[in-house]
């Protein structure tokens, strides 16, 4: 089996305030098995924005079913953007621990801007 | 400059066999899954098969099941078509394709090649 | 097997018009795995938008997608003379990997 890869393609989306953004990733592998989660920043300060594991997201949806079989897909939609959402978004693979999951690889991450709502 | 060169294509009787090759240049092939997709003359576009960039799965279109085999030599950077048992309807023109990502099969296919045309007739 | 439907099969338009051309699914689809392109005649097709929604490089603004489920859509909002040619959807994902027939933009 290949080694996993998490692939984000955009490096930059840029979104009208108050439009949706979709933050696109996907895996290369099924293996290992574990949650995916996305963050917003880096680090020990990075702020998690969806967990598939657990926890509620109000404004955050899945592009695919997350728990279709043989799903690679693990892109989301942030709705009503605002300027405070700008960042670089990552979307991090674990690998199923005990008694905690383990960070297992990132992806390059996405830097999403923010625009002007039109007039 | 990102590129795919076809050949292989040519006139082959009822029930012959032609070999398809494509020639990658200017990025990491064996990093991309790849995909051959066919044209009959004045019909749309008809997707074939497909391959991981490992060339460990490999995936087909009913049309073509049991007939065309796909592969690859990432060495050699060049993805081949086996058509076996051809018949009237596989003739057209051949297209390889990369697909955009690394993950197989997600969000499209954005390299083509011009395409090499199969005409089977006897 | 999803079957993908494109309709209109030919829309004949001005330079300058808007084009809004629809691809419908056979049963929902996830937009990741939906794409579209465009032919010219003796060329090959080109990517034109990805995951339903996003432009591919090199595609201009005036090309965009949108839609979900079973709906999807490309307008093209003012048509250039370059943009008369064959669009095709796709659906990826899974196997097949099945094209749309077709919509073709000819001048009016």
């Known amino acids: 089996e290949d080694e996993l890869q998490v692939i984000q393609p955009e490096k930059s989306v840029s979104v009208a305030a108050g439009e949706s953004a979709t933050l696109r990733c996907a895996m290369t592998s099924l293996i290992p098995v574990g949650p995916i989660m996305w963050f917003r920043g880096a680090g020990a300060g990075r702020e998690l924005i969806y967990n598939q594991k657990e926890g509620h997201f109000p404004r955050v949806t899945t592009v695919s079913e997350l728990t279709k079989r043989n799903n690679l897909d693990f892109s989301i939609s942030i709705s009503n953007i605002t300027p405070a959402d700008a960042g670089t978004y990552y979307c991090v693979k674990f690998r199923k621990g005990s008694p905690d999951d383990v960070e297992f690889k990132s992806g390059a991450g996405t830097e999403l801007s923010v625009r002007a709502k039109p007039s | 400059e990102v590129q795919l060169v076809e050949s292989g294509g040519g006139l082959v009787k009822p029930g012959g066999s032609l070999r398809l090759s494509c020639a990658a240049s200017?990025?990491?092939?064996?990093?991309?899954?790849m995909n051959w997709v066919r044209q009959a003359p004045g019909k749309g576009l008809e997707w074939v098969s497909a391959?991981?960039?490992?060339?460990?799965?490999?995936y087909y279109a009913d049309s073509v099941k049991g007939r065309f085999t796909i592969s690859r030599d990432n060495s050699k950077n060049t993805l081949y078509l086996q058509m076996n048992s051809l018949r009237a309807e596989d003739t057209a023109v051949y297209y390889c394709?990369?697909?955009?990502?690394?993950?197989?099969?997600?969000?499209?296919?954005?390299?083509w090649g011009q395409g090499t045309t199969v005409t089977v007739s006897s | 097997e999803i079957v993908m439907t494109q309709s209109p099969g030919t829309l004949s338009l001005s330079p300058g018009e808007r084009a809004t051309l629809s691809c419908r699914a056979s049963?929902?689809?996830?937009?990741?795995?939906l794409a579209w392109y465009q032919q010219k005649p003796g060329q090959a097709p080109r990517l034109l938008i990805y995951?339903?929604?996003s432009r591919a490089t090199g595609i201009p603004d005036r090309f965009s997608g949108s839609g979900s489920g079973t709906d999807f859509t490309l307008t093209i909002s003012r048509l250039e003379p370059e943009d008369f040619a064959v669009y095709y959807c796709?659906?990826?994902?899974?196997?097949?990997?099945?094209f749309g027939g077709g919509t073709k933009v000819e001048i009016k």
């Open positions: 200017g990025f990491t092939f064996s990093a991309y899954g």
């Open positions: 049963q929902s689809v996830s937009s990741s795995y």
């Open positions: 796709q659906l990826l994902g899974s196997s097949p990997r099945t």
């Open positions: 394709a990369k697909d955009f990502t690394e993950v197989v099969g997600w969000l499209g296919m954005d390299v």
């Open positions: 391959i991981t960039s490992s060339g460990r799965s490999t």
């Open positions: 995951g339903a929604s």
